[in-house]
Interface confidence: medium
């Protein structure tokens, strides 16, 4: 349905609130160096003018499009040039071609100071004194930081940061109330940014097609009990949600999620039995609780795929009739029935069925060819179960920390020319997956875990696409996006690596180091035994564990002395020294 | 009982236009999706269109895409299925029928009407 005023439908759709968040997270995501007092001002006179437009759909300006309206509102901006440098050539382009321009420009690794948490009575002090700032203030150090966030979800997260500032501020401890809230908003928010960083890049990289085979086999184990209709239904709508948060549509995509969430909880019979408790919550916590609802128990009744896919006669003539809608349905049927597998292993499975089927139905006996093409996933299958197997194993066996070593190690090994930092954060990042997934039960694990390294991959071919490095990593990243993690398992030693030369100064430390948080203390230790990697790419990993032992015996001694920082300057010497010889 | 009566079909030349409509009866209409199917002369039946019990989304089989548009009327309980571009391999009985539970088979369909496409 067409509307005079573009931005007057989503101001009066969304309300004032929703509608100056989303604006400020726009323009956030976009000009992500911006200070927050300028962008607040560029969103006051958009929401006026919005105003103007909802008062008189006929006022001048109001029948221009939203991305013309924005574009021409940060093309205003007066230090562009200074601060963006070439960004500030996409403001001679005209629309479509200035958002395309705008979006190519966002960085995924901004040169931001990380966030720092002040004291909890300057925090409450804050939000007790101007609440809307302060709400305002997260919304653009989130967005800023996380150019792709899923905008709507921000507002949810931003909803419970207000609520745990509201609770906290009017308890007895207000530390022990707001810390760990802060902390699960934190890493909830760390956790839901990467996973939507994945879904842009599958729809921008690989296409919409990618995208909706994903979210088929997403929904079908969700929704087991949902015909296939029905969750097609569900993945347009879901694709048109995505495509356009990831295109910087904020405002239609937030629009769009409440209609479809309006849509889910008016037709919760056809869907999934789970929905009911998502839908007697508001807006925001809603649209989050379908997003995040468990799967739907099965039908008792599934029969055997084989008769439809394998030894019915029309296999080949459905196919040839609609592709898609035939692999479409196959891949609902494996998926409803597979809430064990990994949705990257269930699309593999439909890539190999569709593999078959084009060589087969080409064949001068299709069903002779195809008849043993399910015999022919069973590698497919085992390969992820065998992976996650040894993995937990190696987690229960080492712990967090020690199983993220093993990890640093293994991908320094992999992909050596990847930036210290990047590898220290990929594969601190993927030594979580235990915690997260070695703990649930068996048919839980490789859903948990093959689909939780799909996102940390995708960080990792993000940042290297910013910066490329590595032919290895290119592959992995571009070649296909389900078999990223196949193809980053499969890496071997780099034997064309040419070692980096020793620089003590890397292993130079000092009195600092016995003041840091524990994390930071590992993330030191880390980018440490990365260096050594790099230096020593053939090192055994009984050479490495005693280099690292002797580190954290000289840190722990240098941090008890009285006079630390003279231990550090005499002992640090020796350590380096001594690892040459263990390495040499 | 589950009832589903197709119209609109004849004789038209290839280039033609065609309108077939399926007046739907004894179940909830709209909260079942619906698809048109057809069998040529001498052939097995053949997947044409599917729609959604909201109206989006649509399927076409490859062989009509871009020809063919299936839309539907809930508050009327009828299916409609508009044929552009006609050629003579479109010449068959089209039958409308609720889409199927499970897989590419349907639970029921009506009696058909011919569409014959000749010059």
């Known amino acids: 349905d067409t509307h005079k005023s573009e931005v007057a439908h989503r101001f009066k759709d969304l309300g004032e609130e929703h509608f100056k968040g989303l604006v400020l997270v726009a323009f956030s995501q976009y000009l992500q160096q911006c200070p927050f007092e300028e962008h607040v001002k560029l969103v006051n006179e958009v929401t006026e003018f919005a105003k103007t437009c909802v008062a008189d759909e006929s006022a001048e300006n109001c029948d221009k499009s939203l991305h013309t309206l924005f574009g021409d509102k940060l093309c205003t901006v007066a230090t562009l040039r200074e601060t963006y440098g070439e960004m500030a050539d996409c403001c001679a382009k005209q629309e479509p071609e200035r958002n395309e321009c705008f979006l190519q420009h966002k960085d995924d690794n901004p040169n931001l100071p990380p966030l720092v948490r002040p004291e909890v009575d300057v925090m409450c002090t804050a939000f007790h004194d101007n609440e809307a700032t302060f709400l305002k203030k997260y919304l653009y150090e989130v967005a800023r930081r996380h150019p792709y966030f899923y905008a709507p979800e921000l507002l949810f997260f931003a909803a419970r940061y207000k609520a745990a500032f509201a609770e906290c501020c009017q308890a007895a401890d207000k530390a022990a109330c707001l810390l760990p809230k802060l902390d699960e908003l934190r890493d909830e928010g760390k956790a839901s940014s990467a996973k939507q960083r994945l879904k842009c890049a599958s729809l921008q990289k690989f296409g919409d097609r990618a995208f909706k085979a994903w979210a088929v086999a997403r929904l079908s184990q969700k929704f087991p009990k949902a015909e296939f209709a029905e969750v097609s239904k569900l993945v347009t709508d879901l694709t048109k949600v995505h495509t356009e948060c990831c295109h910087g549509d904020l405002l239609e995509c937030a629009d769009d999620r409440a209609d479809l969430a309006k849509y889910m909880c008016e037709n919760q019979d056809s869907i999934s039995s789970k929905l009911k408790e998502c839908c007697d919550k508001p807006l925001l916590e809603k649209s989050h609780c379908l997003a995040e609802v468990e799967n739907d128990e099965m039908p008792a009744d599934l029969p055997s795929l084989a008769a439809d896919y394998v030894e019915s006669k029309d296999v080949c003539k459905n196919y040839a009739e609609a592709k898609d809608v035939f692999l479409g349905m196959f891949l609902y049927e494996y998926a409803r029935r597979h809430p064990d597998y990994s949705v990257m292993l269930l699309l593999r499975l439909a890539k190999a069925y569709e593999a078959t089927l084009e060589k087969c139905c080409a064949a001068a006996d299709p069903h002779e060819c195809y008849a043993k093409v399910f015999d022919e996933f069973q590698p497919l299958v085992e390969e992820p179960q065998n992976l996650v197997k040894q993995n937990c194993e190696l987690f229960e066996q080492l712990g967090e920390y020690k199983f993220q070593n093993a990890l640093l190690v293994r991908y320094t090994k992999k992909v050596p020319q990847v930036s210290t930092p990047t590898l220290v954060e990929v594969s601190r990042n993927l030594g979580k997956v235990g915690a997260k997934c070695c703990k649930l039960p068996e048919a839980k694990r490789m859903p948990c875990a093959e689909d939780y390294l799909s996102v940390v991959l995708n960080r990792l071919c993000v940042l290297h696409e910013k910066t490329p490095v590595s032919e290895k990593v290119t592959k992995c990243c571009t070649e296909s996006l389900v078999n990223r993690r196949p193809c980053f398992s499969a890496l071997e030693l780099d034997e064309a690596y040419v070692p980096k030369a020793f620089n003590a100064e890397t292993f130079t430390f000092h009195a600092d180091m016995c003041t840091l948080s524990e994390k930071e203390k590992q993330v030191k230790k880390q980018t440490a035994l990365v260096e050594l990697v790099k230096h020593k790419p053939k090192a055994t990993k009984e050479q490495l564990k005693g280099v690292m032992d002797n580190f954290a015996a000289f840190v722990e001694k240098c941090c008890k002395a009285d006079d630390k920082e003279a231990c550090f300057a005499e002992e640090g010497p020796k350590f380096v020294a001594a690892s040459q010889a263990a390495l040499a | 009982e589950v009832q589903l009566l197709e119209s609109g079909g004849g004789l038209v030349q290839p280039g033609g236009s065609l309108r077939l409509s399926c007046a739907a009866s004894?179940?909830?209409?709209?909260?079942?999706?619906m698809l048109w199917v057809r069998q040529a002369p001498g052939k097995g039946l053949e997947w044409v269109s599917v729609?959604?019990?909201?109206?989006?989304?649509?399927y076409y089989a490859d062989s009509v895409k871009g020809r063919f548009t299936i839309s539907r009327d809930n508050s009327k309980n009828t299916l409609y299925l508009q044929m552009n571009s006609l050629r003579a391999e479109d010449t068959a009985v089209y039958y409308c029928a609720k889409f199927p539970s499970r897989k590419m088979k349907f639970d029921y369909r009506g009696q058909g009407t011919l569409v014959t496409v000749s010059s």
């Open positions: 729609i959604h019990q909201s109206g989006t989304p649509t």
């Open positions: 004894g179940f909830t209409f709209d909260t079942s999706s």
